[in-house]
Interface confidence: medium
């Protein structure tokens, strides 16, 4: 309706205020100046606009900033952020951690949306690496964030950032991700003493190689079964019965309950039954006495 395109007399918005919640969509379109909206974005979030009204406000900003919103506007988007598409967000250049926090706050308590994932991606790429402050912020809002990154993306995490990682942040990480994170953690915690070091490194051990597990077995660390079960199978297989006994300490008894599961099952198959019997746990499936064990991988390496 053409006659509705002009702003009715006396309705031109001089500021973004609560009177606008009573404007019809076409009145908002006609009576609110986009530049005024951009300078008073911080007010929008304090006013209970309907979703339909927010659509109109977004449209006005899109017209004003076709190349993407400036950060001064982005920081104050508030609930309008939920109206943005990943395509919109890809046009942004977000550099301030405060802006990132403000937008994550809007989505707090919900699963990571495609919008949030795109926002984080833009932010991290803009910074060049996943620094400690950013990681602190992201894992506070999304504990599983770290495990959502590819090994390639994780490679940009500096060792110093590892201090911000909590055990629960790694719950959903797969071995490939832990392979990348473990060396960084080892580097980050290298100056800590034995027991303190183990407490910090424990969550990352799913990426540890055999030689590091052997070293840990000499330090009376008493690794729990849950941690042991997350170790790389290829790292556990070469460990001797004596090393596993030292590594687990009192938790060694738990091997019986896990004897049918990896990596325990595969490790048992590699041990001499005599050695397994010394544990007194009734573990079965080891190599019978008198059998010769050929390490084919070593043979291949020599040929």
């Amino acid at each position: 309706e053409v006659e509705k395109t002009a702003c009715p007399s006396g309705k031109k918005a001089r500021e973004i205020d609560e009177s606008l919640i009573f404007y019809k969509k076409w009145e908002l379109e006609a009576c609110v100046d986009a530049a005024l909206l951009a300078t008073q974005m911080d007010r929008v979030n304090a006013i209970p606009f309907t979703y339909e009204q927010l659509d109109v406000l977004k449209h006005k900003l899109d017209e004003l900033y076709p190349q993407g919103y400036p950060e001064s506007v982005i920081q104050h988007l508030g609930y309008l952020f939920l109206k943005m598409s990943p395509e919109d967000i890809r046009k942004w250049n977000v550099t301030s951690l405060e802006t990132l926090k403000a937008l994550l706050e809007v989505n707090k308590g919900h699963e990571m949306s495609p919008q949030v994932a795109t926002l984080i991606d833009r932010f991290v790429k803009g910074r060049g690496q996943l620094d400690k402050d950013t990681l602190d912020t992201l894992t506070a809002f999304y504990p599983g964030y770290l495990c959502s990154l590819s090994p390639e993306e994780l490679s940009s995490v500096p060792p110093s950032s590892i201090w911000a990682v909590r055990p629960q942040d790694l719950d959903t990480c797969d071995p490939r991700q832990l392979d990348v994170l473990y060396p960084k953690a080892r580097l980050a915690f290298q100056n800590m003493n034995g027991s303190e070091y183990f407490v910090k490194i424990q969550s990352f051990l799913g990426g540890a190689p055999t030689e590091d597990l052997k070293a840990l077995s000499q330090q009376n660390v008493s690794m729990d079964l849950a941690t042991f079960m997350k170790l790389r199978t290829d790292a556990v297989l070469p460990l001797t019965v004596a090393e596993v006994q030292k590594l687990l300490g009192p938790h060694v008894e738990g091997l019986k309950a896990e004897e049918r599961h990896r990596p325990v099952r595969d490790w048992i198959l590699r041990q001499r039954q005599d050695d397994l019997d010394t544990l007194g746990l009734g573990l079965q499936g080891g190599i019978p006495n008198g059998y010769l064990v050929l390490d084919l991988s070593m043979q291949e390496a020599l040929s």
């Epitope: 006396g10 609560e18 009177s19 979030n45 006013i47 209970p48």
Partner: antibody
Framework: EVQLLESGGGLVQPGGSLRLSCAAS????????MSWVRQAPGKGLEWVSG????????YYADSVRGRFTVSRDNSKNTLYLQMNSLRAEDTAVYYC?????????WGQGTLVTVSS | QSVLTQPPSASGTPGQRVTISCICS????????VSWYQQLPGTAPKLLIY???KRPSGVPDRFSGSKSGTSASLAISGLRSEDEADYYC???????????FGGGTKLTVL
């Protein structure tokens, strides 16, 4: 200059009725939501009712719902509050205020006393 | 009992900075703006802060407001004797579909 002037207060018996008016000037009355707020003697502020510019929906505090009715006449720039079945606890100074989320202008108030 | 809780009283000496808190016990106010009102003895209330932190023209910059999560606060710096008044916070409650005020804080300038 924005001005809000309440009238219609006075002494009324419990169960009685009263109609308050608020004459507005200095702004485009038909563009803004309006509200009634009251304050019992020595007590804090209590929101009573709110009405949007087009009278589309009306909002009431639980304590007055079903007894009070808010209305407005945009052609007369006037806000009204019809109060029925008045109780002793309705005794208060009644203020009209501009807006519904942040009351940027207030009248001077009119005293309503409900007593036998 | 109000869903907005304020301390009943606060005090300070001239020149001091005082802060009045407003704690919200309803999640329905979380996303809505908080306003602050000053009521001098024997007068109608006056809007002091709106949209959490905005000052209407004419209100000195000694008055400032902030809001974080379910808590809002009003700060008054360089306290003056004329600041002695009752202060109320208020916000729209989306579940009640109505406006709520805090119980008010009586500020005394010693």
């Amino acid at each position: 200059e924005v001005q809000l002037l309440e009238s219609g207060g006075g002494l009324v018996q419990p169960g009685g009725s009263l109609r308050l008016s608020c004459a507005a000037s200095g702004f485009t009355f038909s563009n803004y939501a309006m509200s009634w707020v009251r304050q019992a003697p020595g007590k804090g502020l209590e929101w009573v009712s709110g009405i949007p510019p087009d009278s589309g929906s009306k909002y009431y505090a639980d304590s007055v719902r079903g007894r009070f009715t808010v209305s407005r006449d945009n052609s007369k720039n006037t806000l009204y509050l019809q109060m029925n079945s008045l109780r002793a606890e309705d005794t208060a100074v009644y203020y009209c205020a501009k807006n519904m989320l942040s009351f940027d202008y207030w009248g001077q108030g009119t005293l309503v006393t409900v007593s036998s | 009992q109000s869903v907005l809780t304020q301390p009943p009283s606060a005090s300070g000496t001239p020149g001091q900075r005082v802060t009045i808190s407003c704690i919200c016990s309803s999640s329905n106010i979380g996303s809505n703006a908080v306003s602050w009102y000053q009521q001098l003895p024997g007068t109608a209330p006056k809007l002091l802060i709106y949209y959490n932190s905005k000052r209407p023209s004419g209100v000195p910059d000694r008055f400032s407001g902030s809001k974080s999560g379910t808590s809002a606060s009003l700060a008054i710096s360089g306290l003056r004797s004329e600041d002695e008044a009752d202060y109320y916070c208020g916000s729209w409650d989306s579940s009640l579909n109505g406006y709520v005020f805090g119980g008010g804080t009586k500020l005394t300038v010693l």
